[in-house]
């Protein structure tokens, strides 16, 4: 029926309006309404002045589409033509009462379909649905994903694609890590992973300024080392160093009326010179103190050497060795005086003997037949040396005796010529300043080392060598090696050294091959004014060792591996150092700081006398240490 | 001793394929620890990478480009091959390859691509 | 991605003079590369692996740097050293290049 009224209603149009000109009135007729009327009239009036005939060229040459009258004005009445709607986004187009509908696609919005809707945006559909991205398109959407993730079929969600299963070598000789969308490739620690080669290298901490003093790097970690010869060790920060503190303080005090006789490892203390008239003869005498067992007090001669007087201890008693052109005599006498205390010696040469005094007392009377020393030209000329004698005189004596000795002597007089111009040359060298208060032992003030030559393979035993070594410490800072033994090639086989421990004011004990410390005794409190005693036993399948606290036999997994590197060296030559290392490099051992406090050492059941050593810093006393310093009311 | 040469079609239209040959000599791309590169600079600007191919095949690409970027290689030629689809003017640049290994990195001379309707 | 900020974006030296230009990663790097391009030339390397000299380089070049903060300095300049310079990094995909310092002589 619709259809029939629009064929109608074309008819009474094509008769009305195009076959004659027709006015408002005549066109409400056709159209039976007035929006369609009012909607038609003004175009048709355009139609008209578009093609009447008499209209300018150029009229007809608008921009008008339709060829003729007749299409002009049956365009009118169809809303949809020409098409109002979007074309992307219409499906259809319904002609209605002068007006259209446009019939959207889905995907698009709008009176005329102009308008994509963004599914992406859709409140009730988050993100369209995408588990990932939403791409919004015109009239439609679609979802994709992150790199690293691959469309499932149901094309919106998304899954991680394992780079690491997908292709094995993607890393390399790393190790390949899958993370979401995307994968890692992991280095052990200390390394870092080189794309450009797909490997593992070494970091280089040392290049990056990790440590403040010495850094040693190795694969896959590096080291940091402190200048312990300068008083440094590692902070606990394993980077940092810090000065190693003194945990006990010493009693340092020295008086300069008090002679240093061990100034010198090798070597006169002090040398004078006589010059007297010949009616005088030799005389000395002094305080003496010491712990020394052995060693040279003083040593007089002639000016032309041929007549000689040793005043020394041997044993810790006085001894007197005389040579000149009557006689030549060795006597020792005496109670011992290494005690320790003040001891007043003299020794005077008298007409027909010279007479030996300890405390006043008569202890040694030796005949001499004629003068000690030979005056010439009316003068007696005689040199006195302290604590040695020239190096020439050790062939001639009649007993040989090892020179050094730890002692000091004050109130000395000799020639009867008092101290005169003595003690101004003392006062002004610090060195030669003996300390005030001296306990036994040996010291070491963490300046220096002694070094021993000790045969470890002279036994019979199978295993060939041995170490066993007693040490009685006490330290005055709580970091230093204690003993060290060193290889021609500058390694350490084998150390034992002090280290502060973690927990305060207590130390720990370590023992190492080379840089590896094999075994840690931890938290002792060592820095106290009493000794503490130690021992160590090892050969080349064993580790023994005993502290205050515990003995125990040690093995773990690495001790065997360490105790083949110790018995490789020890098959060579090694040299044993107290106190300290030699000049080898701050990453051979895990400790490098001198040693600094009292330490008496036994190696193989000998007691190591500091005079016998090879060669001692000169600091190190071989036979006094200082007492603890004691903290007065004033103070 | 080391060389690399790039070589491609001078100029091409927009939407079109670009493909860079890059024929090297003096070492081996089988070799462990070597890889290629593909790098491009725009006149008067600066460097941007594009793709790496690695001895073992392994390909990477930049991922603002990965779409379009093809990398492969013919170790038994000595050669390595870049693809760019549907290029732009914004493609117009010199393209360079570049060697990565474990004896120095070397560049090639560069090619020059414009692209212009 | 990491991005590469080069400093300064131009600087000019007098023969002689020690010049320092400075890499600044938007990340922390492990391995940073430095190129010398003059005009019409291709890029030469000059640094590879942060502080390694390239073959044929010359020593007064030398790198340094970790983390996100890397130079390249010239402990004197010469005039052939007038070039653009730019750092790379080869810790990550995708692979960047600094924006580039151009050197010229005073």
């Known amino acids: 029926a619709n259809s029939l009224l629009e064929e109608t209603k074309q008819g009474n149009l094509e008769r009305e309006c195009i076959e004659e000109l027709c006015n408002k009135e005549e066109a409400r007729e056709v159209f039976e309404n007035d929006p369609e009327t009012d909607y038609f009239y003004p175009k048709y009036l355009v139609c008209l002045r578009s093609f009447q005939t008499g209209l300018f060229t150029a009229a007809r040459q608008s921009t008008n589409a339709y060829p003729d009258l007749r299409s002009c004005v049956n365009a009118i009445p169809d809303q949809c033509s020409p098409l109002p709607c979007n074309e992307d986004g219409y499906m259809s187009c319904k002609d209605g009462k002068a007006s259209f509908t446009c019939t959207c696609k889905p995907g698009w919005q709008g009176e005329k379909c102009e308008f994509d809707i963004n599914e992406c945006k859709d409140p009730s559909n988050i993100n369209g649905g995408c588990s990932q991205i939403c791409d919004n398109t015109p009239g439609s959407y679609h979802c994709s994903c992150k790199n690293g993730f691959v469309m499932l079929s149901n094309k919106k969600d998304c899954k991680d694609v394992d780079e690491c299963s997908l292709k094995p070598s993607i890393c390399g000789t790393a190790v390949c890590k899958n993370i979401p969308g995307d994968f890692e490739c992991e280095c052990p620690e200390g390394y870092r992973y080189n794309l450009k080669s797909k490997s593992c290298e070494d970091i280089d901490e040392c290049s990056e300024n990790m440590c403040a003093q010495l850094c040693v790097n190795y694969p896959g970690g590096y080291t940091c080392y402190c200048d312990g010869k300068k008083g440094f060790k590692l902070a606990q920060d394993q980077k940092s160093c810090e000065v190693v503190s003194v945990c006990l303080p010493l009693n340092l005090d020295t008086k300069y009326e008090l002679l240093y006789l061990a100034e010198q490892f090798a070597g006169v203390v002090l040398y004078l010179k006589f010059r007297l008239p010949e009616i005088s003869r030799f005389s000395a005498e002094f305080d003496f103190r010491t712990y020394d067992s052995e060693g040279v007090i003083l040593y007089a001669e002639s000016i032309d050497h041929s007549a000689w007087l040793l005043i020394a201890l041997r044993g810790g008693k006085i001894e007197v060795q005389l040579k000149n052109e009557h006689t030549s005599k060795i006597t020792t006498g005496g109670d011992v005086i290494n005690n320790g205390l003040w001891n007043m010696v003299s020794v005077e040469e008298l007409e027909h003997s010279i007479s030996i005094k300890i405390a006043k007392e008569a202890v040694m009377d030796i005949n001499k037949p004629g003068p000690l020393f030979k005056p010439e030209n009316g003068l007696l000329e005689t040199k006195v040396y302290f604590a040695g004698f020239p190096r020439k005189v050790e062939s001639e004596l009649i007993k040989p005796i090892n020179p050094r000795l730890d002692g000091c002597i004050r109130s000395w007089n000799l020639m009867k010529q008092g101290a005169s111009g003595i003690k101004e040359i003392i006062q002004e060298k610090q060195n030669k300043h003996c300390l005030v208060t001296v306990e036994k032992g040996s010291y070491y003030p963490g300046s220096g080392i002694a070094q021993f030559h000790i045969d470890y393979n002279n036994v019979s035993s199978a295993e060939g060598w041995h170490v066993n070594v007693t040490l009685n410490i006490r330290p005055s800072t709580g970091t230093g090696v204690m003993l060290a033994l060193v290889s021609g090639n500058n390694t350490v086989p084998f150390a034992v050294s002090l280290v502060d421990s973690t927990s305060e004011k207590s130390q720990d004990i370590l023992l190492s091959v080379e840089n590896t410390v094999i075994y840690r005794i931890q938290a002792l409190s060592l820095c106290s004014d009493q000794q503490s005693h130690l021992e160590f036993r090892v050969n080349r399948n064993n580790l023994e060792l005993s502290t205050p606290l515990k003995i125990e036999t040690i093995s773990h997994e690495d001790l065997q591996r360490q105790l083949a590197v110790l018995d490789k060296a020890m098959k060579a030559k090694v040299a044993t150092y107290l106190g300290g290392l030699p000049d080898v490099p701050f990453s051979a051992t895990p400790v490098n700081a001198f040693y600094n406090g009292c330490m008496e050492v036994n190696i193989n059941g000998v007691q190591l006398d500091l005079d016998e050593a090879i060669s001692k810093h000169n600091d190190i006393r071989a036979h006094s240490c200082p007492s603890v310093w004691k903290k007065t009311k004033n103070s | 001793q080391v060389t690399l040469k790039e070589s491609g079609p001078g100029i091409l239209q927009p939407s079109q394929t670009l493909s860079l040959t890059c024929s090297f000599s003096g070492f081996s791309l089988s070799t462990s620890g070597m890889g290629v590169s593909w790098i491009r600079q725009p006149s008067g600007k600066g460097l941007e990478w594009l793709a790496h191919i690695y001895w073992d095949d392994d390909k990477r690409y930049n991922p603002s480009l990965k779409s379009r970027l093809t990398i492969s290689r013919d170790t038994s030629s000595n050669q390595v091959f870049l693809k760019i689809t549907s290029v732009d003017t914004a493609d117009t640049a010199t393209y360079y390859c570049?060697?990565?290994?474990?004896?120095?990195?070397?560049w090639g001379q560069g090619t020059t691509l414009t692209v212009s309707s | 991605q990491i991005v590469l900020t080069q400093s300064p974006a131009i600087m000019s030296a007098s023969p002689g003079e020690k010049v320092t230009m400075t890499c600044s990663a938007s990340?922390?790097?492990?391995?940073m590369y430095w190129y010398q391009q003059k005009p019409g030339s291709s890029p030469r390397i000059l640094i590879y692996?942060?502080?390694n000299l390239a073959s044929g380089v010359p020593v007064r070049f030398s790198g340094s740097g970790s983390g996100t903060s890397y130079s390249l300095t010239i402990s004197r300049m010469e005039a052939e050293d007038a070039a653009t310079y730019y750092c790379q990094q080869w810790s990550s995909y995708p692979l960047t290049f600094g924006a580039g310092t151009k050197l010229e002589l005073k």
């Open positions: 570049a060697l990565y290994g474990n004896y120095g990195d070397y």
């Open positions: 990340s922390s790097v492990s391995y």
């Open positions: 692996d942060t502080s």
